[in-house]
Interface confidence: low
């Protein structure tokens, strides 16, 4: 299910994740009770076309919402995990309230106010950086954008847009925050596997869990088609057909020695004798090519206490 979030006492409007380009009616339900959400605007939470509106949202609204698109041949159901947070007491915006980071490297750059297109808003949008209102002439608010002239590293930080949603004669505040980073011109190179070492043998205990990290670096800056993955006997983990052995969902990204690196972890819930005979390949690939480090598992020798 997709996730959406908002702040207590602000407006939150969300769309059905299954919507696509459909023009068919959408019904919304509380998924825990199957209770349908009304379309009457007098309700604080109501449905309007394909949208679910919380006017205003409250912490108690957090939960999973289901939307059903009813078309003549097929009903499509989507699920949306909505979390309403209390306003952060300080200026430090927690990660869970952040929209995607914007990366800029040009002399002039623009930041878009997230989710604003869902709302009935009127200009101007107010912009804040690390909670301070932006008043320098270098910062120009235009429609749903913030334009920054002569971008430098000092412009990095958390940018919050604040606008008003109007509904039924009432105005509601909406705020959204995203980070802005300035990237130096990067470089791309043939992948380098930093872990595990080449032809490594790892000691494991039968019946115990084991995890092996595959880490590789690809250069600096944005990397097109860079990936790390595990293979078992030259088969990708997902197709190997052994439920005990899983590749960790979601690649862990890190920056090491000014290099951009990726890590994928192979987890074995309970090592068996059979696992000792398998070959485990850590693969790293990008547009420059592919590199493979093979590792094997060996039974851990018991410590001799004599």
């Amino acid at each position: 299910s997709k996730s959406s979030w908002g702040l207590e006492n602000e407006a939150l409007i969300v769309r059905c994740p299954q919507r696509g380009r459909s023009t068919y009616p959408v019904e919304w339900y509380y998924s825990d009770t199957n209770e349908s959400i009304p379309t009457q605007k007098r309700n604080r939470i109501f449905v309007s076309r394909d949208r679910l509106k919380f006017l205003p949202a409250r912490v108690e609204d957090s939960g999973i919402y289901a939307c059903v698109i009813r078309s003549p041949n097929l009903n499509k159901t989507g699920y949306l995990n909505v979390t309403i947070h209390k306003k952060p007491p300080s200026c430090n915006i927690p990660d869970y309230l952040m929209y995607s980071t914007v990366r800029g490297s040009d002399k002039n750059f623009k930041i878009t106010c997230p989710t604003i297109d869902l709302y009935n808003w009127t200009a101007p949008v107010q912009w804040f950086k690390n909670c301070k209102a932006l008043q320098e002439p270098r910062f120009r608010a235009h429609r749903s954008y913030l334009f920054i002239d002569n971008v430098t590293h000092d412009d990095e930080g958390d940018y919050t847009c604040q606008f008003t949603h109007a509904e039924n004669g009432t105005n509601y505040i909406v705020t959204a925050t995203r980070s802005f980073t300035v990237e130096e011109k990067g470089f791309s190179m043939f992948p380098v596997i930093t872990n595990p070492p080449y032809n490594h043998t790892m000691e494991v205990e039968i019946g115990k869990p084991a995890s092996i990290a595959c880490s590789a670096c690809f250069g600096k800056g944005s990397h097109f088609l860079a990936d790390v993955l595990w293979q078992i006997n030259k088969t990708v983990v997902g197709n190997f057909g052994e439920a005990r052995i899983q590749e960790e969902e979601g690649r862990n990204e890190s920056s090491s020695n000014d290099m951009d690196c990726l890590t994928s972890v192979l987890r074995i819930t309970g090592v068996t004798e059979k696992d000792l005979s398998l070959e485990y390949d850590c693969l790293a690939l990008n547009l420059h090519g592919m590199i493979r480090h093979t590792i094997r598992l060996r039974r851990k020798q018991p410590i001799d206490h004599r």
């Epitope: 207590e8 509380y30 009770t33 209770e35 604080r44 409250r58 912490v59 108690e60 939960g63 209390k86």
Partner: antibody, heavy 122, light 107 residues
Framework: EVQLLESGGGLVQPGGSLRLSCAAS????????MHWVRQAPGKGLEWVAT????????HYADSVKGRFTISRDNSKNTLYLQMNSLRAEDTAVYYC???????????????WGKGTTVTVSS | DIQMTQSPSSLSASVGDRVTITCQAS??????LNWYQQKPGKAPKLLIY???SLESGVPSRFSGSGSGTDFTLTISSLQPEDFATYYC?????????FGGGTKVEIK
């Protein structure tokens, strides 16, 4: 008949534990948010905790956070309040109450139990 | 947290009197306000929800009004069974908070 019936109250020493139960009947329990509200002797009403219909959303008063746990079993139509590390100031009549609107909390508490008395004293 | 202040804390009235109790919120709660009646040794009873909507089964002599921060509960003609304590409660944000109560006594 729509009814809520609390049980589990009693006398307990400071630092002790109690588990209150609230049996619901006569309505679709699994569709309603539920609350615990307490009233100290001679005092006003104080909200304690709330749980959503499917237990997605749980909230506590600051005064009980970390010590009390609200839960529900929709298959048994029962609401619970596990109270640990009890203090003298927790002495009160504890009421369970139904949220009038289903699934989100908005319309007030329209059905109340008779209450169960918790006394914390050495 | 939103503070709810009720006034008066007690009042004496006679049967047939028009009685008004006020409740003030420490911030704008729009119309998310409920009124309860509680008699000694009994559980509270919901009278009014969303500031002015009469709960089912509640006599029409009870009415509520207000929006934002100032709210009023009115009993148009006090009856013997109305002598009780009345509480307001906001349901605008967590935690839901109650006023301190207004005790309506027989004069």
């Amino acid at each position: 008949e729509v009814q809520l019936l609390e049980s589990g109250g009693g006398l307990v020493q400071p630092g002790g534990s109690l588990r209150l139960s609230c049996a619901a009947s006569g309505f679709a329990f699994s569709s309603h948010w539920m609350h615990w509200v307490r009233q100290a002797p001679g005092k006003g009403l104080e909200w304690v905790a709330t749980i959503s219909s499917g237990s997605h959303s749980i909230h506590y008063a600051d005064s009980v956070k970390g010590r009390f746990t609200i839960s529900r079993d929709n298959s048994k139509n029962t609401l619970y309040l596990q109270m640990n590390s009890l203090r003298a100031e927790d002495t009160a009549v504890y009421y369970c109450a139904r949220e009038a609107g289903t699934s989100y909390y908005y319309y007030g508490m329209d059905v109340w139990g008779k209450g169960t008395t918790v006394t914390v004293s050495s | 947290d939103i503070q709810m202040t009720q006034s008066p804390s007690s009042l004496s009235a006679s049967v047939g009197d028009r009685v008004t109790i006020t409740c003030q919120a420490s911030q704008d709660i729009r119309n998310y306000l409920n009124w309860y009646q509680q008699k000694p040794g009994k559980a509270p009873k919901l009278l009014i929800y969303k500031a002015s909507s009469l709960e089912s089964g509640v006599p029409s002599r009870f009415s509520g009004s207000g929006s934002g921060t100032d709210f009023t509960l009115t009993i148009s003609s006090l009856q013997p069974e109305d002598f009780a304590t009345y509480y307001c409660q906001q349901s605008y944000s967590t935690p839901p908070t109650f006023g301190g109560g207004t005790k309506v006594e027989i004069k």
